[in-house]
Amino acid sequence: TLNSVLNSNAIKNLPPPLGGAAGHPGSAVSAAPGILYPGGNKYQTIDNYQPYPCAEDEECGTDEYCASPTRGGDAGVQICLACRKRRKRCMRHAMCCPGNYCKNGICVSSDQNHFRGEIEETITESFGNDHSTLDGYSRRTTLSSKMYHTKGQEGSVCLRSSDCASGLCCARHFWSKICKPVLKEGQVCTKHRRKGSHGLEIFQRCYCGEGLSCRIQKDHHQASNSSRLHTCQRH
């Protein structure tokens, strides 16, 4: 269970304050009740700090990734862990802190000299034909938003939807994320019945556009749960 994992001595690389060793300046504090630590823009107390359970990287903070806290651990128990700094080992881009990406298993700087061509080459090189993972969670391409000079067109590699041009969203495609069209009225959409189930999709659909929501198609109400078709419909 999550509690037993959190209580074990195997916890490595937890986000601040538990992961002060992860190299966040000023974040390593003693575990005395009431100590303050940075939580987003504000400060929170350490005495009620609880690691955040997650199913995928997007659920975590910008300087975190989602993984099992134990080495080679139970993939069913995942929490948000502090990102890896430059020259630290990695298995996917999301593990590296903003401004870095994962190349040949090491977090390297994604400064202005690294253009999209090299990033795409890295994706192919790192993930190539080997679609297995070392630790049971999916590899995800998360790139520093500093790398984008213009809004991404359809098919461009992205980090989040704001990296994409109007009418596009950032969605998973295999083990990277690309700009895809936001869904229009009547288009098939994905309704996630189980929390975290979208973490399993390798061809993620965009969300429904403005004024639309993903609802079961009226003539499919009689269908069995598994075959129900959802489409984008007006509110």
């Epitope: 939580g39 987003g40 903070g61 910008t62 300087d63 704001s162 996630h192 929390k195």
Partner: nanobody, 129 residues
Framework: EVQLVESGGGSVQAGGSLRLSCTAS????????MAWFRQAPGKEREFVAA????????HYADSVKGRFTISRDGAKNTAFMQMSSLKPEDTAVYYC??????????????????????WGQGTQVTVSS
């Protein structure tokens, strides 16, 4: 200018339902959590529900679990809260708020009002017995 505008408040009998909407404008909110807080007369503002930037995670105050449902529209700039089985103690001004995705997220992040950068003006919900 960033604005959060709430709507959908009103008066309802105990056991009834209301649906609150919050429309955000002035910037993209796809990297923000959106939440509802409420404040009853003479009481402190309290957390009600939140939905994360990833859309997959929702958080609720114990007092509303199973009765209220928070959601966001596909384009992510509108949040909704479906309130059912309303009780007189749900009477309050309901505020919509938006919190940026932090560097490090904890279980408490969503319920801590200090983390919310943008706030609406509020909408009144009155539940009579």
């Amino acid at each position: 200018e960033v604005q959060l505008v709430e709507s959908g408040g009103g008066s309802v009998q105990a056991g009834g339902s209301l649906r609150l909407s919050c429309t955000a404008s002035g910037r993209p909110f796809d990297d923000y959590a959106m939440a509802w807080f409420r404040q009853a007369p003479g009481k402190e503002r309290e957390f009600v529900a939140a939905i994360s930037w990833s859309l997959s995670r929702t958080h609720y105050a114990d007092s509303v679990k199973g009765r209220f449902t928070i959601s966001r529209d596909g384009a992510k700039n509108t949040a909704f809260m479906q309130m059912s089985s309303l009780k007189p103690e749900d009477t309050a001004v309901y505020y919509c708020a938006a919190a940026p995705r932090p560097k490090w997220v904890s279980v408490q992040y969503f319920s801590t009002s200090a983390n919310y950068e943008y706030w609406g003006q509020g909408t009144q919900v009155t539940v009579s017995s």
